[in-house]
């Protein structure tokens, strides 16, 4: 049909922090290259209907649906979504094409559905249909990678059964300890599934997709290191594969390695050996112990022995399901305003946990560090000396764990006052929680030393503001004090703070801070 305009439909994805996406803007700046949605004529439909390719959007993502119309003359338009018509403001680009945009900010379930765009040009009327759905990330998974031996080859395959398909990489390091940190120059990354070079010091495999990144380290016993007095432990769940690498370097080839489980040699088919000469002509041997799918009876002490080196053992513990072991009793801390302090949680877990620290409904990243006794520790130091409740939450595939902390900051009270026709009230934070005194200022007592005890009502810690306790004291007005200045004072072991209030007839109440 010669009269039909040339139409292009595009999707623009905006990064979440994209300042160009604003509610007021009907055509935000492009933050990522537009994706062509195809806009094909829908066959067998009454009228002229173009259909764009289906759009899948992540929850909270911001997008723009955009139509470019190459047609002479002016155009008018109307968006319809869920039977509601939405304003439409076409404009023209530098190539004189009509541009119509629909901005969807922070995508939610309610914004998913069919968006119809009705366009009227001088020549013809037509409809464009966009179907927008939320990407079902509930179906997404990211599983920790595991190892398999490559058939008929001395190589390991790294597998992560994840959706969407993850990118798999080997992370190799040939140096000891601290220098094997992720961004160290000693670390080499190989974006491939199969690894043939299995002689390195530290070998990890990582898988990453939209959900993040998960890594598994090849558990290694190095016979050239003096044995630890405490045996390392490896946890696995029933059905998972077991891989332990035993590595030894010696001046010549005249040595052998063997694996034993509880003093019995491993069966053939549960181990394989590789050897190579290093640059200085010493011999490196590695002996893998592996079980393709562990059962409870694979638990025990695995010992790698050499005919030249001291043997070393590791305890392999097979569990039915994952766990997080830690004490969940709540802990209260009291610190000074400038005291350095960190919350810490010591735990033992398998598989590795994901964790967060939360304060005042705000979440903070959680770092965990392995200790050399099989436990891990997570510390949180970024409290900025704000008193309140802090929550540590950890979870893995099989278990959840929450621990509460209360932080109190020792400080002198600060007093706020308010008054009504019938009473005066003073409020204070400060810690330890303050005690109160009320004093009347009069001709007889210009220094406000006359104590008021009648009609005073104290409430300690009656409300929690972001986990911070507040104490209040209320003075009920009596004829004896009406028209006088009164002073409320809050005091604790760190000091005193007072506020002076004029108890006159109804009207504005002046407060005089008096510290």
């Amino acid at each position: 049909n010669q009269d039909l305009p040339v139409i292009k439909c595009v999707l623009i994805n905006h990064k979440n922090n994209d300042s160009s996406v604003g509610k007021s803007s009907s055509y935000p700046m492009v933050s990522e290259s537009p994706e062509d949605l195809g806009c094909a004529l829908r066959p067998q439909s009454s009228g002229t209907v173009y259909e764009a390719a289906a759009v899948e959007v992540d929850v909270s993502a911001s997008i723009t649906l955009q139509v470019l119309v190459d047609a002479p003359g002016n155009i008018s338009c109307l968006w319809v979504f869920k039977h509601s018509s939405l304003n439409c403001q076409p404009h023209f680009d530098l190539q004189n094409r009509g541009v119509v945009s629909m901005v969807i900010l922070k995508m939610t379930e309610t914004q998913a559905g069919e968006y119809l765009l009705f366009i009227q040009s001088e020549a013809t009327n037509y409809t464009i249909l966009f179907t927008v759905s939320i990407r079902n990330t509930l179906l997404y998974t990211l599983r920790r990678p595991y190892f398999r031996k490559m058939e008929n080859q001395d190589a390991l395959v790294c597998i992560s059964e994840s959706v969407p398909e993850p990118i798999v990489e080997w992370v190799l390091c040939d140096s000891q300890g601290e220098s094997c940190k992720e961004e160290s120059p000693a670390v080499v990354k190989k974006e491939e599934k199969v690894l043939h070079e299995l002689f390195g010091t530290d070998i990890r495999c990582c898988a990453r997709n939209e959900l993040g990144r998960e890594c598994t380290r090849l558990f290694t016993i190095d016979l050239n290191q003096t044995p630890q007095t405490t045996l390392p432990q490896l946890f696995l769940k029933v059905g998972e594969p077991l891989w332990i690498r035993c590595k030894a370097v010696h001046v010549n080839h005249g040595f052998g390695l063997t694996w034993e489980l509880e003093n019995k040699a491993l069966e053939e088919g549960n181990y394989f050996e590789m050897s190579t000469y290093s640059t200085n002509r010493t011999m490196i041997r590695i002996l893998f112990a592996f079980v393709s799918s562990v059962a409870r009876n694979d638990t025990g002490y695995y010992t790698c022995s050499s005919s030249k080196h001291p043997s070393q053992s590791a305890l392999v513990t097979i569990v039915e399901k994952g766990f997080i072991n830690a004490t969940n009793s709540s802990e209260d801390y009291e610190i000074d305003q400038y005291e350095e302090f960190c919350f810490s949680v010591r735990f033992k877990a398998y598989p590795q946990i994901r964790c967060t620290w939360t304060f005042s409904r705000k979440s903070f990243p959680c770092e965990q560090k392995g200790l050399d006794n099989g436990y891990s520790i997570s510390k949180f130091c970024n409290h900025k000396h704000q008193p309140g409740e802090y929550i540590f939450h950890a979870e893995n595939d099989d278990a959840q764990f929450t621990k509460m902390f209360t932080l109190n900051i020792r400080r002198k009270p600060q007093v706020l006052a308010e008054a009504s026709a019938s009473q005066a009230s003073c409020f204070s934070d400060g810690y330890p929680l303050p005690s109160w005194t009320w004093k009347k200022c009069s001709d007889k007592s210009p220094n406000c030393t006359e104590e008021i005890t009648e009609g005073v009502w104290n409430r300690k810690a009656n409300r929690k503001v972001f986990g911070q306790w507040v104490s209040s004291s209320t003075l009920n007005m009596s004829e004896a004090i009406k028209g006088f200045l009164v002073k409320c004072c809050a005091y604790n072991s760190l000091g005193t703070s007072c506020e002076t209030i004029l108890l006159n007839s109804p009207g504005p109440f002046p407060f005089i801070q008096d510290n």
Partner: antibody, heavy 118, light 111 residues
Framework: EVQLQESGPELVKPGASVKMSCKAS????????MHWVKQRPGQGLEWIGF????????KYNEKFKGKATLTSDKSSSTAYMELSSLTSEDSAVYHC???????????WGQGTTLTVSS | NIVLTQSPASLAVSLGQRATISCRAS??????????VHWYQQKPGQPPKLLIY???NLESGVPARFSGSGSRSDFTLTIDPVEADDAATYYC?????????FGGGTKLEIK
């Protein structure tokens, strides 16, 4: 049969040094870490430290740093301990003991008796 | 340092009866899944001999009359039934943390 043969008794003067030996037989010397333990009558057992004969790594109990020095000789399958600046407090029986990571001190020498006296 | 306290300091048990020796650590001696406590027997004029390793494992060649149990900071050596040859001093030892330490010993007498 595993045997740890320690050197004979020593009588030395205060302030002097002494070097005792522990000759291993019946196993490959470099395959086991060797520990040393002090035993005083009525005072129980005290761990001094260890040497790994394969790579000569050593580790000492803080209390014996500067007092004991551990060495080994692969060619003769012998471990040595030298004690310096001797006082009467050093009078004791000193044992060498072979350490198996899975199983602790599984073979002990009969002990060298050291007497420090003027 | 981890202190190991053995009790009793001495005990006398009739032939064929059960002897129980306790070893209490000043803090946990468990790491990963193992308890790093070992038991030794020492007879006069002889070096110590390993009986039980990692709290409950019987060293090869040691009679099954000897058994070990416990975890964290409480451990027990049991000899059942006691024989005349068992008269000796028994020591517990920990190597969960350096320095390695030994208990003060329990002297077993056979009645």
């Amino acid at each position: 049969e595993v045997q740890l043969q320690e050197s004979g008794p020593e009588l030395v003067k205060p302030g002097a040094s002494v070097k005792m030996s522990c000759k291993a037989s019946g196993y490959t010397f470099t395959r086991y870490v060797m520990h040393w333990v002090k035993q005083r009558p009525g005072q129980g057992l005290e761990w001094i430290g260890f040497i790994n004969p394969y790579n000569d790594d050593t580790k000492y109990n803080e209390k014996f740093k500067g007092k004991a020095t551990l060495t080994s000789d692969k060619s003769s399958s012998t471990a040595y301990m030298e004690l310096s600046s001797l006082t009467s407090e050093d009078s004791a029986v000193y044992h060498c003991a072979r350490w198996r990571q899975l199983g602790s001190l599984d073979s002990w020498g009969q002990g060298t008796t050291l007497t420090v006296s003027s | 340092n981890i202190v190991l306290t053995q009790s009793p300091a001495s005990l006398a048990v009739s032939l064929g009866q059960r002897a129980t020796i306790s070893c209490r650590a000043s803090e946990s001696v468990d790491t990963y899944g193992s308890s790093f406590v070992h038991w030794y027997q020492q007879k006069p004029g002889q070096p110590p001999k390993l009986l039980i390793y990692l709290a409950s494992n019987l060293e090869s060649g040691v009679p099954a009359r000897f058994s070990g149990s416990g975890s964290r900071s409480d451990f027990t050596l049991t000899i059942d039934p006691v024989e005349a040859d068992d008269a000796a001093t028994y020591y517990c030892q920990q190597n969960n943390e350096e320095p390695w330490t030994f208990g003060g010993g329990t002297k077993l007498e056979i009645k």
